[in-house]
């Protein structure tokens, strides 16, 4: 009985042609949606003139279907028991699951104006950039449509730079027709306890973004884990969205469409300051904004974004220190709505349901030489949007799963 099931599981979770795992791995059978909530700034002039608190009002959800494309360039390497691939990116707007259209407008931070003095911390160049910002009539805030903000728009200020630079700006630009990877993962053929664990990403075993062990690529991509998951296990996974490896711990047992699953959650200490969690010391890469590494709940991923001042957090600054959220009004963090979780079927290690929640923020600092920013009296980590990416096993697949896996065990 049990030995036969274990043998079957070990055979079927291997990532090679013909297995159950491989078929679902190449192209997920789960419909994955990414919902966006945009933080619409209510008092842009007051902030730019008086350095007031930024009043935001979230608007959403605006929903896109994502992860519907099959993995490409799948290549097995029998020598080291790995399989490599790229994951194509694509997003299709779902009007019926959205509160408005892609043409809805929002007042948000001017991404280029905020980023330019951060990238060019040179007073001479800032004077030059100020001339361009003024000429283009750009200011600290801008009004952009959802489509522009997410997927890119031609920035009028950057368009004046008389050199061949990229003038398109967008939170996720470029996205459509791009790929994530190359990933190289263990196929589990020689050792099932390594199945789906990432061996390398973009040809490297480290990210080159963080010092020390923070730079390691740990675990899987969170779509599955090695089988026979125990509650005591810490699930480690790498997320290219946040440019780091992270982990989840057991939270509770859940019944998902008749399938018993373990809900693993991202613990608060994953976002803690080095003061609270010494393991996080290497995620604190600058001392000023982080108040000498005492702030928590935000991750500076600038090194991973060509030096742009991008900070990742949980939505509404959940689990973030008061100094981070204090300059922003209108945030209401809520554990249930804003945490990330993975519902993992413990026998196979397959993630059957998940909710990945994160917030994209941009740092804007006072800049004496740039008129649009010269009245600021303090730096702000400005929330731009938050997203909720969810997937749940379909009813048909759930029935099949019960028949083939959990039913047999019962």
């Amino acid at each position: 009985g049990d030995m036969l099931i274990e043998k079957t599981i070990k055979r079927e979770v291997v990532l090679e042609e013909g297995t159950t795992a491989f078929k679902n791995w190449v192209k997920t059978g789960t419909t994955v949606y990414r919902q966006f909530w945009i933080f619409d700034v209510q008092n842009p002039d007051d902030v730019a003139k008086n350095s007031s608190k930024i009043k935001v009002k979230q608007r959403g959800p605006y929903t896109y279907r994502v992860r519907y494309l099959a993995k490409e360039n799948i290549t097995q390497d029998p020598e080291d028991h790995t399989v490599s691939f790229v994951q194509p990116n694509g997003a299709i707007f779902e009007p019926s699951l959205s509160v408005g259209t892609e043409d809805d407008n929002f007042t948000v931070l001017n991404l280029a104006v905020a980023a330019a003095p951060h990238i060019y911390q040179n007073s001479f160049v800032q004077v030059v950039l100020n001339s361009l910002i003024k000429k283009s009539k750009s200011s600290m805030f801008q009004t952009r449509s959802l489509k522009e903000l997410l997927w890119g728009y031609k920035d009028p200020f950057l368009s004046l730079v008389p050199y061949p630079i990229s003038t398109t700006v967008g939170v996720f630009y470029p996205y459509n027709d791009t790929v994530d990877g190359v990933y190289k993962v263990f196929n589990g053929k020689d050792n099932i306890s390594k199945v789906a664990i990432i061996e390398s990403y973009k040809g490297k075993r480290n990210l080159s973004y963080w010092p020390s062990y923070c730079d390691m690529i740990n675990g899987t991509d969170a779509a599955s884990f090695p089988p026979f998951v125990e509650k005591s296990r810490t699930l480690r996974f790498f997320s290219s969205d946040i440019c780091r490896s992270i982990y989840a711990v057991f939270g509770s047992e859940i019944d998902l469409k008749g399938i018993p699953v373990y809900r693993f959650v991202l613990p608060a200490n994953a976002f803690a300051s080095p003061l609270q969690n010494p393991d996080n010391h290497c995620f604190c890469t600058e001392k000023v904004i982080s108040n000498n590494c005492t702030s928590y709940g935000v991750l500076d991923i600038g090194k991973c974004k060509e030096g742009k001042p991008v900070y990742i957090s949980l939505p509404h600054f959940l689990h973030a220190s008061p100094d981070v959220s204090e300059p922003i009004e209108g945030l209401h963090p809520n554990e249930d709505e804003h945490r990330t979780y993975l519902d993992v079927e413990p026998i196979t290690g397959f993630t059957l349901q998940f909710a990945k929640r994160l917030q994209v923020n941009i740092l804007v600092k006072p800049a004496r030489k740039i008129e649009a920013l010269k009245n600021l009296k303090r730096p702000y980590i400005v929330p731009i949007l938050w997203l909720n990416e969810t997937g749940t096993i379909g009813d048909e697949k759930a029935e099949m799963f019960k028949t083939q896996v959990t039913g047999k065990i019962k």
């Epitope: 030059v128 100020n130 001339s131 003024k134 004046l160």
Partner: antibody
């Protein structure tokens, strides 16, 4: 092809005035801004004045502040340096130069200004 | 104002020699340093920007290094056409300032 051509140099008495011109071709001065840099005989290079892009602000070395004025006529793609109250120590070859990020990638051939009685 | 101090003020070298010119800024200018070559009666020519970035068309025997306050221009194998005066310049803060120059002469 990018080119800068200075003109207007010559001999002038102390206290006198002179206007130098810098005609640009192959790029628009509006987009880059223009600098003037001078070199006294047998000496090193000294930055003098700058007009930032798009009719932006103007900046001057302390040694010429209040006496020299930089300007540009974008329709002619030409920059000017109006030099008043000239002194013997202003004697130099004056170069106009193109810069965006603060280094000078193109220079004119220079025009000699001699201040002497 | 940021002072740029170049050394030596002059040097004698032979064709094929490796030549090093240094430049020290009076305060941190990160990597915002350019190097120029000037021949008598001619305008300066840009060699290097951002301390290390070779300008297009400049021979690869020229290289720049350094960041913060200390910078170096190296000519790996001196050629006859390299005998000239070399200037460093900081492009970090206005006013833009130059070093006093280093004259490279034939030994």
């Amino acid at each position: 092809e990018v080119q800068l051509v200075e003109s207007g140099g010559g001999l002038v008495q102390p206290g006198g005035s002179l206007r130098l011109s810098c005609a640009a071709s192959g790029f628009t001065i509006d987009a880059f801004g223009i600098h003037w840099v001078r070199q006294a005989p047998g000496k090193g290079l000294e930055w003098v004045a700058w007009i930032a892009p798009y009719g932006g602000d103007t900046y001057y070395a302390d040694s010429v502040k209040g006496r020299f004025t930089i300007s540009a006529d974008t329709s002619k793609n030409t920059a000017y340096l109006q030099m008043n109250s000239l002194r013997a120590e202003d004697t130099a070859v004056y170069y106009c130069a193109r810069s965006f990020f603060g280094y000078f990638d193109y220079w004119g051939q220079g025009t000699l200004v001699t201040v002497s009685s | 104002d940021i002072q740029m101090t170049q050394s030596p003020s002059s040097l004698s070298a032979s064709v094929g020699d490796r030549v090093t010119i240094t430049c020290r800024a009076s305060q941190d200018v990160s990597n915002w340093v350019a190097w120029y070559q000037q021949k008598p009666g001619k305008a300066p020519k840009l060699l290097i920007s951002y301390a290390t970035s070779l300008y297009s068309g400049v021979p690869s025997r020229f290289s720049g290094s350094g960041s913060g306050t200390d910078f170096t221009l190296t000519i790996s194998s001196l050629q006859p056409e390299d005998f000239a005066t070399y200037y460093c310049q900081q492009h970090s803060n206005a006013p833009l300032t130059f070093g006093q120059g280093t004259k490279v002469e034939i030994k």
